[in-house]
Every structure is written in structure tokens, then in C-alpha cells.
Amino acid sequence: HNFNITIKEIIKMLNILTARNDSCMELTVKDVFTAPKNTSDKEIFCRAATVLRQIYTHNCSNRYLRGLYRNLSSMANKTCSMNEIKKSTLKDFLERLKVIMQKKYYRH
């Protein structure tokens, strides 16, 4: 039940973040969603949270990005590998995270 509430809250944050296209959305971040198919949810959440934590250093930390980081961290492994070479914009990262979260919400 708590898992579903957290996912729902994450989706709301992603909905409002992806509606906008401010300067921060152009930030380059690691494309952490190119992981193998068998990667666990907790590993994916950890990777996504790590990307969000790195955004803090760019003066792009609004309340929704902070909330996303908090919520993802609460469901994630404490550590994870971050050896991706590929990059994406923050906007694309958030759009892809939204698709992943919607799939998880409707599956539960």
C-alpha cells in the first residue's frame, strides 16, 4: 500500500516537472535506464536517485526534484553502480522515469 502511495506521488511530481521546459531541463545527466532487463527495481531507483542528487550542485534543485530524490531513495538500494557512458537531458531522463513509474503503478 505504502509503495503504491509513493509511486503515485512520484508520478504527480514527474507530471508537473515534464510539463515545463526551464533551463534546468537541458542539463546533461547519465542515461541510467540503459541497464540490462534483469536489473532490479531497487537498483533502478538507486541509479535514478543518484542522478537527482548530482543535480543539487547545479542550482536546479526545486521542491519536486528534491521530493523525487527523497521518494526514490526510500525505495532504493543504498548503493549502486553508475558506469553509464551514454548521456541524456534531464527532460528526457524524467520522461523515461515517468513511463517506468506508470508501468509499476498500474502493475500493482
Epitope: 508520478i11 504527480k12 507530471n15 508537473i16 515534464t18 510539463a19 515545463r20 526551464d22 519536486y64
Partner: antibody
């Protein structure tokens, strides 16, 4: 202290043009989306347009798209609304507002009256 | 584009609790915002992200949002709460800010 001051409201004939300005102070203007919202006499709030922090990216309500243009000059901490082909139904108080994911600061508004 | 429906008017007795609703398809999937507007004044943000209050807004004002209805609750109503109240959401598909039609709250007594 955050302040937004709108100017430029006037009486104008249908088909005429007007440019509204909104001067911002008390915050880093270039770091925020800004919006224009209007309110016809005795009516509710209607969002008009918004512009991203660095300019360029704009959105408009269907009722004004193609007639109104929102812009900003971050060096002057000023937001603009160019209003062309004005109609009687554009008569309203026009507010500018800071948009920090929620319209958290508003100006006092400027009255635009479109009438012959 | 999203459509948000509010009752045009709501009355409450002094000291009692008033609820103002804002109905919209799947509004619970979006964040709801609420504004208070007194005559001759600009609107003021009183609730953001469904239920959070900006600093300076009294605890008597609270918000909730579920499925198709967002609700603003004013407990222990005071004379100064008499005003117009507007809900607002972000419409993702239209990339637009959408307001409800507004509700006039009358405080009786």
C-alpha cells in the same frame, strides 16, 4: 521583499494594440517562469500566457494565441505582454505572477478596457 | 484541456467548518493549488501541492486531493475568510495553467 508592478493598462478601441509591462524586484527574476493572468469584471481568473526563465519557450491560452505575445528582458527584470487585435472580451484586470510551480507572488494588476 | 468545476457559492457559520470542492477528471493525478482573493485585491496562494501551506497561511486552512475532487477546508471560519477561492492545476497535455470558476465563501453571523 518580492514585488511585481504592472503598468500599461488603458482604454483602447477594438482592433487596437497595447503593451503591458511588469517590473519585478526582490528576487532573481531570471530564475523563474512568469505568467500573465486576467480577470474580467465580476468574473473568475483566466490564465493568459507564460514564459520560461530564460525566455524563448512560451505558452498561450487558446483565447489569445496569435494575438498576444509574452516576452521578457531579464537584464531589466521586466515581463511584457504585447496585445494586438484587441476585442471587447479582452477587457479585464491583467496580473503578472511569479510561477514557482504555483503562482506564489502576484502584482496588483492593471486594467485594460476595450471599447469604442 | 482540463475543466475544473467549483460551486459558485458556499456559506458557513462563524466558527464552523467550510469545505470548497474542485471537481475534475482524475484531478488526483495532478497537484492542486488554491488561491484566496478578497475584493479589490490580487489573489494569494494559500495551498500548494494539494495540502501544503505557504508561510503565513494559518493552519485553519487545509487541502486534500483524491481521484476526481480536490477540497479546501476552512475550519473555525472567521469573518476575514469571506472571499473568493480558486482552485488551479497544471494541464500537462495543453501545457497550460487551468483555474476553476471560483467559489464565493460567505461567513454568516
Amino acid at each position: 521583499e518580492v514585488q511585481l508592478v504592472e503598468t500599461g493598462g488603458d482604454l483602447v478601441e477594438p482592433g487596437g494594440s497595447l503593451r503591458l509591462s511588469c517590473v519585478a524586484s526582490g528576487f532573481t527574476f531570471s530564475g523563474y517562469y512568469m505568467s500573465w493572468i486576467r480577470q474580467a469584471p465580476g468574473k473568475g481568473l483566466q490564465w493568459v500566457a507564460d514564459i520560461r526563465d530564460s525566455g524563448g519557450n512560451t505558452h498561450y491560452a487558446d483565447a489569445v494565441r496569435g494575438r498576444f505575445t509574452i516576452s521578457r528582458d531579464n537584464a531589466k527584470n521586466t515581463l511584457y505582454l504585447q496585445m494586438d487585435s484587441l476585442r471587447a472580451e479582452d477587457t479585464a484586470v491583467y496580473y503578472c505572477a511569479r510561477d514557482d510551480w504555483g503562482l506564489d507572488y502576484w502584482g496588483q494588476g492593471t486594467l485594460v478596457t476595450v471599447s469604442s | 484541456q482540463s475543466v475544473l468545476n467549483q460551486p459558485p457559492s458556499v456559506s458557513v457559520n462563524l466558527g464552523k467548518t467550510a469545505s470548497i470542492t474542485c471537481e475534475g477528471d482524475n484531478i488526483g493525478d495532478k497537484y492542486a493549488f488554491w488561491y484566496q482573493q478578497k475584493p479589490g485585491q490580487a489573489p494569494v496562494l494559500i495551498i500548494y501541492d494539494d495540502s501544503k501551506r505557504p508561510s503565513g497561511i494559518p493552519e485553519r486552512l487545509s487541502g486534500s486531493n483524491s481521484v476526481n475532487t480536490a477540497t479546501l477546508t476552512i475550519s473555525g471560519a472567521r469573518a476575514e475568510d469571506e472571499a473568493d477561492y480558486y482552485c488551479q492545476v497544471w494541464d500537462n497535455s495543453a501545457k497550460a495553467i487551468v483555474f476553476g470558476g471560483g467559489t464565493h465563501l460567505t461567513v454568516l453571523g
